[in-house]
Amino acid sequence: HTAAQDNCTCPTNKMTVCSPDGPGGRCQCRALGSGMAVDCSTLTSKCLLLKARMSAPKNARTLVRPSEHALVDNDGLYDPDCDPEGRFKARQCNQTSVCWCVNSVGVRRTDKGDLSLRCDELVRTHHILIDLRHRPTAGAFNHSDLDAELRRLFRERYRLHPKFVAAVHYEQPTIQIELRQNTSQKAAGDVDIGDAAYYFERDIKGESLFQGRGGLDLRVRGEPLQVERTLIYYLDEIPPKFSMKRLT
């Protein structure tokens, strides 16, 4: 299915416009901003979601900018260029003709340049480390229970296969979730770790992208797991190219 047929909505992306104008009167949904058709049986790509987010009228926006400490996009939100499959184009430019190269999750991986900047390929982010700090609880969570519940969450809510959740580390109050997915491992139909991480990030912030599903209610043996801060680190298959000036 591409969308819920009865009321023609997109369960996996509320930033869509849906109408029964698909083949045979089937419900078809298009992402805001880009107008691209989306498959509502799976997660929408981060690129299309960012584009939809930027297209939403500012006064009506229910979604907020990432917090300063999130390492996801420390350049802030931008209106990305997406390819016909909804992936980030390797080169992104703003309205003042400043350009930069991004990885598959849309994070800048080079210094900024001008229109002459070349980005030969979209470099894949193959390893994502999600670093969470949970609110104080009566005691520490059981590590194996926490591991099982987080893998179940990624499987059931984001449809990310457990094999892509490489590890769950826990040293109270810090939880680290490692997602790994090489190009060779990702089969057709597999959810991308970058998309799963973005949906998770938005869920943690109380900005769920799902339509009609409740917000994230994460519990370990009945005990609520409440996150008070999130940091996300991205590792690319090819190391980024920043000048020494930036590194100092």
Epitope: H1, E156, R159, P162
Partner: antibody, heavy 120, light 110 residues
Amino acid sequence: QEQLKESGGGLVQPGGSLTLSCKASGFDFNNYGVSWVRQAPGKGLEWIAYIYPTYHNTYYATWVNGRFTISSHNAQNTLYLQLNTLTAADTATYFCARDAGGTDYNFNLWGPGTLVTVSS
Amino acid sequence: DVVMTQTPASVEAAVGGTVTINCQASQSIESYLAWYQQKPGQPPKLLIYEASKLASGVSSRFSGGGYGTEFTLTISGVECADAATYYCQQALTIGNVDNPFGGGSEVVVK
């Protein structure tokens, strides 16, 4: 050929314990999740527990209440279900069932089952 | 806890006819529903997954439909070999679940 084969069933007294085994062959155990499902004589299917062997993640039906334990020996491609404090209500055929390898929980490979009879 | 309710518990079908079995989920499971066929003395066999997709080697006489909370299994051109008990199963979650299977529907072929 992909196969699952349960063993370890038999007659056990009320209050007793039993460990069931499920041997997998023809596929790599670590790429799938596996469940135990039981069926009392003339009744419907009842899910018991699920394990994702690679990470030893285990999940149980709410009614299990710690009486049963699912585990696996990955090198031997074998799944186990330990049954404790058995009562007559636990009399059933116990099946192991493998998921299809995706992210939903449909079971496309089943063993023939092993019968557990709890009686004095 | 998602509870699955199947109707009818038993249904008679004539050879060559059509039979429909219903399954209702207590809350939305989107399209995460599977159907199984079980014959006496045998383990269940997966027929349909994701509400409408035919499992490998299953006859196209079997079809599934529905979304959210209401689902159907339809057997068209019923054959004697279709006499069995059919079970639906929510395939969405194993968290806080009592039993993901419906109670079963027996199909008797006349």
